[in-house]
C-alpha cells in the first residue's frame, strides 16, 4: 500500500465532497468488499463495518484494511492512517474511540486490498449518529372509558445510558410504535422530545406490544428499537371503582 500515491489520488478528487456513507445497509452487487454501515451511538465514538464476501472464492485477495483521513487543518492530513482498532466493534469493522472522534471535521475512509482501494466514503460524525435503544420502558394506567371498553396509558422510558442528555450534547427525539400482539402492522406516533407519552383508546381485552426508538434531533438516523414492552389491560370487572380512573 502506497500511502502518498493513494493520498494524492483521493485528495485530487476533494474527498470531502464524495458521496456520504448511507447509514443503512447496502446491497453488495459486486464481489468486492463494500462499506455497509458507519454508526456513532453518542457523537463521541464511531465504528464502520464492511462486507467480506470476497474471501469466499475470489482469487488473490489480500487482507482487507481500512484507512482514514480527517480534515484537521488547512488541507487534508497528508497521510492515510490505518484503522486504530479492528477488534472492538466486531468482525469486519473498525472502531474509533473518543480520541479519534470529533463532530467538527469531515472524515474520509477507504477499504483497501493488495494496495488498491475497493471502496471509499466521506461523512461527518453527526450524519452517522444512530443512538442505542431507549431503556427501562414501563407503563401506567391513566383512565378507563365509562363503557369499560377502552383505556388510556402513559408509557415512560429512559434515554440510552451513553447519550449525554443532561449537558445537551445530544438532543434525542423519540418515536413510539404500538400494536396488538396478533397484528403485524405497527401504529406509529408522531416524534416527541420527551421520555413519556400517553397512548389513547387501547382495547381493554387485548394485549399490546410497545416499542420506542430514538434519533438525534436534526441529523442522523433512527437507532434500533427498544425491547418490546407488553401491555395487558385488566378487564373492567377487576376495577373496584370506575371513578378512580377519572
Amino acid at each position: 500500500f502506497s500511502g502518498s500515491e493513494a493520498t494524492a489520488a483521493i485528495l485530487s478528487r476533494a474527498p470531502w465532497s464524495l458521496q456520504s456513507v448511507n447509514p443503512g445497509l447496502k446491497t453488495n452487487s459486486s464481489k468486492e468488499p463494500k462499506f455497509t454501515k458507519c454508526r456513532s451511538p453518542e457523537r463521541e465514538t464511531f465504528s464502520c463495518h464492511w462486507t467480506d464476501e470476497v474471501h469466499h472464492g475470489t482469487k488473490n485477495l489480500g487482507p482487507i484494511q481500512l484507512f482514514y483521513t480527517r480534515r484537521n487543518t488547512q488541507e487534508w492530513t497528508q497521510e492515510w492512517k490505518e484503522c486504530p482498532d479492528y477488534v472492538s466493534a466486531g468482525e469486519n469493522s473498525c472502531y474509533f474511540n473518543s480520541s479519534f472522534t470529533s463532530i467538527w471535521i469531515p472524515y474520509c475512509i477507504k477499504l483497501t486490498s493488495n494496495g488498491g482501494t475497493v471502496d471509499e466514503k466521506c461523512f461527518s460524525v453527526d450524519e452517522i449518529v444512530q443512538p442505542d435503544p431507549p431503556i427501562a420502558l414501563n407503563w401506567t394506567l391513566l383512565n378507563v372509558s365509562l363503557t369499560g371498553i377502552h383505556a388510556d396509558i402513559q408509557v415512560r422510558w429512559e434515554a440510552p445510558r451513553n447519550a449525554d442528555i443532561q449537558k445537551g450534547w445530544m438532543v434525542l427525539e423519540y418515536e413510539l410504535q404500538y400494536k396488538e400482539v396478533n397484528e403485524t402492522k405497527w401504529k406509529m406516533m408522531d416524534p416527541i422530545l420527551t421520555t413519556s407519552v400517553p397512548v389513547y383508546s387501547l382495547k381493554v381485552d387485548k394485549e399490546y406490544e410497545v416499542r420506542v426508538r430514538s434519533k438525534q434531533r436534526n441529523s442522523g438516523n433512527y437507532g434500533e428499537f427498544s425491547e418490546v414492552l407488553y401491555v395487558t389491560l385488566p378487564q373492567m370487572s377487576q376495577f373496584t371503582c370506575e371513578e378512580d380512573f377519572y
Partner: antibody, heavy 115, light 108 residues
Framework: EVQLVESGGGLVKPGGSLRLSCAAS????????MDWVRQAPGKGLEWVAE??????????YYAESVKGRFTISRDDSKNTLYLQMNSLKTEDTAVYYC??????WGQGTLVTVSS | EIVLTQSPGTLSLSPGERATLSCTAT???????LHWYQQKPGQAPRLLIY???NLASGIPDRFSGSGSGTDFTLTISRLEPEDFAVYYC?????????FGGGTKVEIK
C-alpha cells in the same frame, strides 16, 4: 490563494437586524465547511456558527448565545457566506470573522450595537 | 462546553528569551483537536500550530507545541520582535468549538 472578504458590518440599534456577507475565492467553496467567529473589542475569540457543504446537507450549528437570533447560510453559486443577525443586543458588538474550517480567516467586519 | 483557561494572561519578555504559554481544559481534549493561533493588533488570527504539535504552513520552527489530556503548552524558543502578539488556544473535540482567553506576549 484562499481569500475571504467580509462586508455588511456597521452601527445598528439594539433589537435591529444586520446581514453580513463573506466573499470567498481561491478554493472550492461548495465543498467547504464555513464558520463565523467573533471578537468583542479588547476581548477573546468566540465561535458563532458553522454551515457545512451540500454533501453534508448544509447542516448548521450555532453557539447558544446566538441560537434563534442568528442564521448562517450560503450561496454556492456566488461563493458567498452570510450571517443574518436579528434581535441584536449590545453584547453582539464585535468584529465578525468569516473562516474556512477556522484555518483561514478574513480580515473581519465590525458590528456595533448601540442606542 | 469545554472551557480553556490560558495562563499567564500577560507575559513580559525580551527578544531572544524563551516563552512558555499554557492552556488548560476543563475536560480532556484529544491532541488532534487542539490548535494555537497568533493575533497581532488590527489583524485576523493566524493558525500557528494544529493538532497540538504540528506547525501550520509558513510558521518558523522556533514555535512548538506539546501536551495531552487537559494540559497543553505553546513554546517559543527564542522570541523575535514579530512574535509579540496575543496567542489563543482552541479546541473542537467534544463540545462546541471554544477558544482560550488569550495570552499576551509583550516586550519587557
Amino acid at each position: 490563494e484562499v481569500q475571504l472578504v467580509e462586508s455588511g458590518g456597521g452601527l445598528v440599534k439594539p433589537g435591529g437586524s444586520l446581514r453580513l456577507s463573506c466573499a470567498a475565492s481561491g478554493f472550492t467553496f461548495s465543498d467547504a465547511w464555513m464558520d463565523w467567529v467573533r471578537q468583542a473589542p479588547g476581548k477573546g475569540l468566540e465561535w458563532v456558527a458553522e454551515i457545512r457543504s451540500k454533501a453534508n446537507n448544509h447542516a448548521t450549528y450555532y453557539a447558544e448565545s446566538v441560537k434563534g437570533r442568528f442564521t448562517i447560510s450560503r450561496d454556492d453559486s456566488k461563493n458567498t457566506l452570510y450571517l443574518q443577525m436579528n434581535s441584536l443586543k449590545t453584547e453582539d458588538t464585535a468584529v465578525y470573522y468569516c473562516t474556512l474550517y477556522r484555518d483561514y480567516w478574513g480580515q473581519g467586519t465590525l458590528v456595533t450595537v448601540s442606542s | 462546553e469545554i472551557v480553556l483557561t490560558q495562563s499567564p494572561g500577560t507575559l513580559s519578555l525580551s527578544p531572544g528569551e524563551r516563552a512558555t504559554l499554557s492552556c488548560t481544559a476543563t475536560s480532556s481534549v484529544s491532541s488532534s483537536y487542539l490548535h494555537w493561533y497568533q493575533q497581532k493588533p488590527g489583524q485576523a488570527p493566524r493558525l500557528l500550530i494544529y493538532s497540538t504539535s504540528n506547525l501550520a504552513s509558513g510558521i518558523p520552527d522556533r514555535f512548538s507545541g506539546s501536551g495531552s489530556g487537559t494540559d497543553f503548552t505553546l513554546t517559543i524558543s527564542r522570541l523575535e520582535p514579530e512574535d509579540f502578539a496575543v496567542y489563543y488556544c482552541h479546541q473542537y473535540h467534544r463540545s462546541t468549538p471554544t477558544f482560550g482567553g488569550g495570552t499576551k506576549v509583550e516586550i519587557k
